[in-house]
Interface confidence: low
């Protein structure tokens, strides 16, 4: 656990020509704020995807208004720094938004209006518990100057706040089998209290309370054996091989978002559909009033003051949601042929052909096998003016990208277990049954004899992470 | 194409040090966890140690800690395995292996592994 801390040195203009006008008026006093939000890695996605690592808003800056005939100069600003808890391991690389916003402070009917002036994002490698890095972002004419780092909240220390540490109790040195914490030499690792029961032979853990399994060992307690050879099973005379993506619980499991929220899986994680009243990451946090500023990208903050009341964001155009946080997508109209990829880029949309397909929008048909990559094995087989992917055993689609489920039908009689494997399936047969696809009784005599399983995988063998 | 190609191995005798290399094309190694493998005549495969680029975190399985080191080098898009004080029952074919990002279930992250080299014979003999 630990804290991204940002320090905003300085918003302005920037230098060159075009000066850009103040955003503030005698007319018009106003103020700024800044929103910050962090997603883990080094990630290009859209501005408004989740903030999986968190988000902040500053408090608001002191009220300025433009004296006439001045340039604009730097704006007056909010004091103190924005605070990004993060409860699990700092992730050592980042993707950031900082978004400046100006609150007018005129007479508008139903209090202030907020627009976003300027949003400049990056992607940095930072690791914890170092010093302070200084950066300068341009959006448009405008600038931004500011710090930032990430800190481990004790007793967590180390570069990705991972290892916990305590002041020693002894003076002299640490415990039996405890390290001193480095770069503190005045404490020690903490030895960590993991779940009731983890096997001490077979498991560990790296944050209290959890059960992690050493190679060879599964189970919540890693108390169960595993073949060690599941998932590296030889496909070749020569080479480690593969076979290890099998379904894991999904994130939505158990619908971590709260207070009603609706949960929908992304590639990394979740994602909270928060009922009004309610936001944060699981939609934790509540009584979200228009003070708050919840409307994003320039949207209009309509409602009461009281932390009852509801507040309702009027969306500019392009923009979509309760806080007019989604961008309209103009890909869900499928304009890209051909299975082509669609990016919304906001000045224009544009289509990333798959091979075999060209054109604006992937309309026009390579029809040959030329510059043709089928994937995970398969072979590009051309005739009658088109062409095909022959796919192997375990792989299906258009170019064998999609990994075929051979249990999908279902296809172990009485109640026998099916585990996909890349060579295919296997049966793990109910008591009283046998047979490549569990279809024969045992004879009382035990005359039969099961059909051998593909290599690397026992019946019954459940697949592991690593 | 993604491809994973090994160097380094060879005859050693005990107690002596190898460095194996892991040279990645295809892909940036940056954006995944990258492991050695090592497979001895008889015995099942052994993950012996990963790396995750990203932050420098690594793992070792038992039978090697305080003797065997992995790296990674983003800008050569290579990744290495130093390994000291070698002894006879570590002879084996050594694999280079890439695990992708295949999720966040419960609290964490896991990675599954999806390619891996040819190998490179390591022998362990005097």
């Known amino acids: 656990a630990g804290v991204f801390e940002l320090q905003i040195h300085s918003f302005g203009p920037g230098p060159g020509p075009g000066a850009p006008r103040s955003p503030c008026s005698a007319r018009l006093p106003c103020r700024l704020f800044f929103r910050v939000c962090l997603k883990p890695g080094l990630s290009e996605e859209a501005a408004e995807s989740p903030c999986a690592l968190g988000a902040a808003l500053s408090a608001r800056g002191p009220v300025y208004t433009e004296q006439p005939g001045a340039p604009a100069p730097d704006l007056p600003l909010p004091d103190g720094l924005l605070q990004v808890p993060f409860r699990d391991a700092w992730p050592g690389t980042f993707s950031f938004i900082i978004e400046t916003w100006r609150e007018e402070l005129g007479d508008q009917i139903g209090g202030p209006a907020w627009s976003l002036l300027a949003r400049v994002a990056g992607r940095r490698r930072l690791a914890a518990g170092g010093p302070w890095a200084r950066d300068i972002q341009r959006a448009g004419a405008w600038e931004l100057r500011f710090s930032y780092r990430a800190r481990c909240e004790p007793p967590a220390v180390g570069t990705a706040c991972t290892r916990l540490c305590r002041p020693r109790s002894a003076p002299s040195r640490c415990g039996p089998g405890l390290r001193p914490c480095a770069p503190l030499e005045d404490e020690c690792e903490a030895p960590l209290v993991c779940r009731a029961g983890c096997s001490p032979e077979h498991g560990f853990c790296e944050q209290p309370g959890e059960c992690r399994c050493l190679e060879g060992w599964t189970g919540p307690l890693c108390t169960v054996p595993v073949s060690t050879s599941s998932c590296l099973s030889p496909r070749g005379p020569s080479s480690a091989t593969t076979g290890c993506l099998v379904p894991g619980p999904g994130p939505c499991d158990g619908n971590p978002c709260a207070n009603g929220g609706s949960c929908s899986e992304t590639p990394r994680s979740f994602e909270c559909t928060c009922p009004r009243g309610f936001y944060g990451l699981r939609c934790e946090v509540s009584g979200v009033t228009c003070a708050d500023g919840p409307c994003f990208n320039g949207g209009l903050c309509v409602g009461g003051a009281d932390p009852d009341s509801a507040y309702i964001c009027h969306c500019p155009p392009g923009f979509q949601g309760s806080n007019c946080e989604k961008r309209v997508d103009r890909c869900s109209l499928q304009p890209c042929r051909n299975g082509g990829l669609c990016l919304d880029l906001g000045h224009a949309l544009r289509c990333r052909c798959r091979a075999g397909f060209a054109g604006p929008r992937c309309e026009h048909d390579l029809d040959d096998c030329a510059g043709r990559a089928c994937a995970n094995g398969g072979t590009c087989v051309e005739g009658g003016g088109a062409h095909r992917c022959s796919c192997a055993l375990g792989f299906g689609g258009r170019d064998c990208r999609e990994r075929a489920d051979p249990c999908a039908a279902r296809p172990c009689a009485h109640g026998g277990r099916c585990y996909a494997h890349f060579s295919g399936l296997v049966c793990a047969c109910a008591p009283g049954y046998m047979g490549a696809r569990c279809e024969f009784p045992v004879h009382p005599d035990g005359a039969s004899a099961l059909p051998a399983a593909p290599p690397g995988l026992r019946p019954g063998d459940p697949q592991r992470y690593l | 194409e993604v491809q994973l190609v090994e160097s380094g191995g060879g005859l050693v005798q005990p107690g002596g040090s190898l460095r194996l290399s892991c040279a990645a094309s295809?892909?940036?190694?940056?954006?995944?966890?990258i492991g050695w493998v090592r497979r001895a005549p008889g015995k099942g495969e052994e993950l012996v140690a990963r790396?995750?680029?990203?932050?420098?975190?690594?793992r070792y399985a038992d039978s090697v800690k305080g003797r065997f080191t992995i790296s990674a080098d983003t800008s050569k898009n290579t990744a290495y395995l130093q390994m000291n004080s070698l002894r006879a029952e570590d002879t084996a074919v050594y694999y280079c292996a890439r695990s992708s990002y295949s999720g966040y279930y419960g609290s964490h992250h896991y990675y599954a592994l999806d390619y891996s080299g040819q190998g490179t014979l390591v022998t362990v003999s005097s």
């Open positions: 295809g892909f940036n190694i940056y954006d995944h966890s």
């Open positions: 790396i995750y680029p990203t932050n420098g975190y690594t």
